[in-house]
Amino acid sequence: MGRARDAILDALENLTAEELKKFKLKLLSVPLREGYGRIPRGALLSMDALDLTDKLVSFYLETYGAELTANVLRDMGLQEMAGQLQAATHQGSGAAPAGIQAPPQSAAKPGLHFIDQHRAALIARVTNVEWLLDALYGKVLTDEQYQAVRAEPTNPSKMRKLFSFTPAWNWTCKDLLLQALRESQSYLVEDLERS
């Protein structure tokens, strides 16, 4: 893809220092779609336009990242810039409407489970970790593993700990994690599948 990322970067680089600061502050409170986490305040405030673009894309992927950026710009009163960003990202992109044949997922690697393909994004973006643990307890996770994940202080560190056990899992164990994700954060799964 790349088009949306470039458009986000272009928009952010056109902000004044004061506007960029305001953008970051608004990003900390803007309503997010279900299934998305917030970029941590500490990291966010020190970022330049390039770092912020990369962070937006890694946290929200290109499509939603661009939409979110446009929403914040609009909220700042920068309607024209928001419109330009959305026009740039919609040009030659966007989801196929109902009834249109969807392209094959050529980016997906055969033989690599969805969970493995999207490891980094899942670590960054899964928020409902406790729910996952309860769904996997006794089926995939031992009591010791369950407690070890729960003991971690943040969602990303919990997910990182959970992923430390997956090399020993077979395909069906990974499917059970994926089922739990579909049930708890369906939008995230759908978004990753599109990416």
């Epitope: 109902a98 009834g99 969807a102 094959p104 997922q105 997906a108 690697k109 055969p110 033989g111 690599l112 489970h113 969805f114 393909q117 077979n170 395909w171 069906t172 164990c173 499917d175 059970l176 994926l178 089922q179 579909r182 049930e183 369906s186 939008y187 799964v189 759908e190 990753l192 599948e193």
Partner: antibody, heavy 122, light 107 residues
Framework: QVQLVQSGAEVKKPGSSVKVSCKAS????????IHWVRQAPGQGLEWMGY????????MYNEKFQGRVTITADKSTSTAYMELSSLRSEDTAVYYC???????????????WGQGTLVTVSS | EIVLTQSPATLSLSPGERATLSCHAS??????LSWYQQKPGQAPRLLIY???NLHTGIPARFSGSGSGTDFTLTISSLEPEDFAVYYC?????????FGQGTKLEIK
């Protein structure tokens, strides 16, 4: 192109077992799951379970747990479904099916075998 | 397990008419639903996956919509070859389940 070719029709006695085969071609056998779905005469479709030949792990519908075993032979790219303790209500067409993409976040069945009729009768 | 209920059980229409088939899930399945067509003596054929994506080679007169618990398969203008049984299937959780089917017959 992807092809799934199943073994021929079987007539079995109640209490016995049946083993249906499904030979796959046109893709890398170990990269995709193979599922089994059955259909009793004039009835709907019922998912029985799947195998992932890459690591031989299988998942089953609890309704059949203990009676169904799904296996795969990587050397011949063939999946097998064995159903034991057969009863008359197991009379059905048994299909093997392969999803559109096993490595995506769902299982939708784009490729099907021709079906194998298993008749259970005394 | 998730139960899928299709309605109507039988739909009698003429070629050229619009067909609307429904599938209701017993719990939220988001967009994880597909539709199949089956003709007598044949294996099912995938039409729509993930609620609204048209499978390769399927005519554009077929379309799918819905999310959560209610889904619809629409055939905009029926062709003679469309008269068959249609099944929905959920991919949200195990065991994977199918609806009981809707028979689309010629009026």
């Amino acid at each position: 192109q992807v092809q799934l070719v199943q073994s021929g029709a079987e007539v079995k006695k109640p209490g016995s077992s049946v083993k249906v085969s499904c030979k796959a071609s046109g893709y890398t056998f170990t990269d995709q799951t193979i599922h089994w779905v059955r259909q009793a005469p004039g009835q709907g479709l019922e998912w029985m379970g799947y195998i992932y030949p890459g690591d031989a792990s299988a998942m089953y519908n609890e309704k059949f747990q203990g009676r169904v075993t799904i296996t795969a032979d990587k050397s011949t790219s063939t999946a097998y479904m064995e159903l034991s303790s057969l009863r008359s209500e197991d009379t059905a067409v048994y299909y093997c099916a392969r999803p559109l993409y096993s490595y995506a976040s769902y299982y939708w069945f784009a490729y099907w075998g021709q079906g194998t009729l298993v008749t259970v009768s005394s | 397990e998730i139960v899928l209920t299709q309605s109507p059980a039988t739909l009698s229409l003429s070629p050229g008419e619009r067909a609307t088939l429904s599938c209701h899930a017993s719990q939220n399945i988001n967009v994880w639903l597909s539709w199949y067509q089956q003709k007598p003596g044949q294996a099912p054929r995938l039409l729509i996956y993930k609620s609204s994506n048209l499978h390769t080679g399927i005519p554009a007169r077929f379309s799918g919509s819905g999310s959560g618990t209610d889904f619809t398969l629409t055939i905009s203008s029926l062709e003679p070859e469309d008269f068959a049984v249609y099944y929905c299937q959920q991919g949200q959780s195990y065991p994977l389940t199918f609806g009981q089917g809707t028979k689309l017959e010629i009026k």
